[in-house]
């Protein structure tokens, strides 16, 4: 079951005991079967996993990966999953741990000898056939290494939100990623109504800023429910 | 201060239902991932359900697939826990937990960040 495949994976954050508000969260450890942590004056027992269900790569922490656990199992149901060290297969730049990249199907380093020159990317656009990529495309890149030393300004090239500044985020141009403006009050956003639809956008808008979320524009009457107009608003 | 206020345990019998509402406040943060989790008695605490931050990924624990649903509320900053078809292995305390990051944030691994003091849920037989 998809359960027991999980259970094999890292703590994620422990609760505060008692409730209310855990500092940050903490990093991952390996688990026995149940983890101790402080309870007023006495030790309490948390399950060593907690699933942290995403639909996209951004949702998850930097050396994750947000995909399906299991191939076939529990449909629709992604979660963030630890992130490919060097030498390990993959499909997407995201599965590889910072510092590394996906070419050819392996997670290689991104130092500065990998990285020469401009981007150069093979594209086979494949959609929902079964040699398909986990975003529907497969790419081989080389980027330049000062991308890693600072961060991506809007309009670099980037593999992932954590190489952009503040305020922007990574997302899909045309068959590349480049760094874009997070999403401001009253601008329009992308609701996907069924996992997995992002992976066939061209043009990747990124998430609603802080105290936003994307929802119905409150004045835009339309028939089809399918068509209406999505804008970050406030809560 | 962040707060996160649940509501909506009780006393019920077996086969009967229950929501359970979880509320967000205070701090100015992106909500991310909500989930519900729960402890019974001599117990570890185990997640029953999470949702990601747009909806469209919700994980279930075995034992209640079919019979819980979890939904959230952006605009509200709720997040809700429809429990149907209760047993009395379901008896426990309920908390809700959110996964809180300040614009731009990331952390190295995604958790839950933020904890409810939890609800008493109590299935009769």
């Known amino acids: 079951t998809l359960n027991s495949v999980l259970n094999s994976n890292a703590i994620k954050n422990l609760p505060p005991p008692l409730g209310g508000a855990a500092g940050h969260p903490g990093s991952a450890v390996s688990a026995a079967p149940g983890i101790l942590y402080p309870g007023g004056n006495k030790y309490q027992t948390i399950d060593n996993y907690q699933p942290y269900p995403c639909a996209e790569d951004e949702e998850c922490g930097t050396d994750e990966y947000c995909a399906s656990p299991t191939r076939g199992g529990d449909a629709g149901v992604q979660i963030c999953l630890a992130c490919r060290k060097r030498r390990k297969r993959c499909m997407r730049h995201a599965m590889c741990c910072p510092g590394n990249y996906c070419k050819n199907g392996i997670c290689v380093s991104s130092d500065q000898n990998h990285f020469r020159g401009e981007i150069e990317e093979t594209i086979t656009e494949s959609f929902g056939n079964d040699h398909s990529t986990l975003d529907g495309y497969s790419r081989r890149t080389t980027l330049s290494s000062k991308m890693y030393h600072t961060k991506g300004q809007e309009g670099s090239v980037c593999l992932r939100s954590s190489d952009c500044a503040s305020g922007l985020c990574c997302a899909r141009h045309f068959w590349s990623k480049i760094c874009k403006p997070v999403l401001k009050e009253g601008q329009v956003c992308t609701k996907h109504r069924r996992k997995g639809s992002h992976g066939l956008e061209i043009f990747q808008r990124c998430y609603c800023g802080e105290g936003l979320s994307c929802r119905i524009q409150k004045d835009h009457h339309q028939a089809s429910n399918s068509s209406r107009l999505h804008t970050c608003q406030r809560h | 201060e962040v707060q996160l206020v649940e509501s909506g345990g009780g006393l019920v019998q077996a086969g009967g239902s229950l929501r359970l509402s979880c509320v967000v406040s205070?701090?100015?943060?992106?909500?991310?991932?909500m989930g519900w989790f729960r402890q019974a008695p001599g117990r570890l605490r185990e997640i029953v359900a999470a949702?990601?931050?747009?909806?469209?990924?919700?994980y279930y624990a075995d034992s209640v697939k079919g019979r819980f649903t979890i939904s959230r509320d952006d605009a509200k900053k709720t997040v809700y826990l429809q429990m149907n078809s209760l047993k009395s292995e379901d008896t426990a305390v309920y908390y809700c937990a959110v996964d809180g990051r300040a614009n731009g944030e990331r952390p190295a691994v995604a958790g839950y960040n933020y904890w409810g003091q939890g609800t008493q849920v109590t299935v009769s037989s």
């Open positions: 205070g701090g100015t943060f992106n909500v991310y991932a």
């Open positions: 949702i990601s931050r747009t909806g469209s990924s919700i």
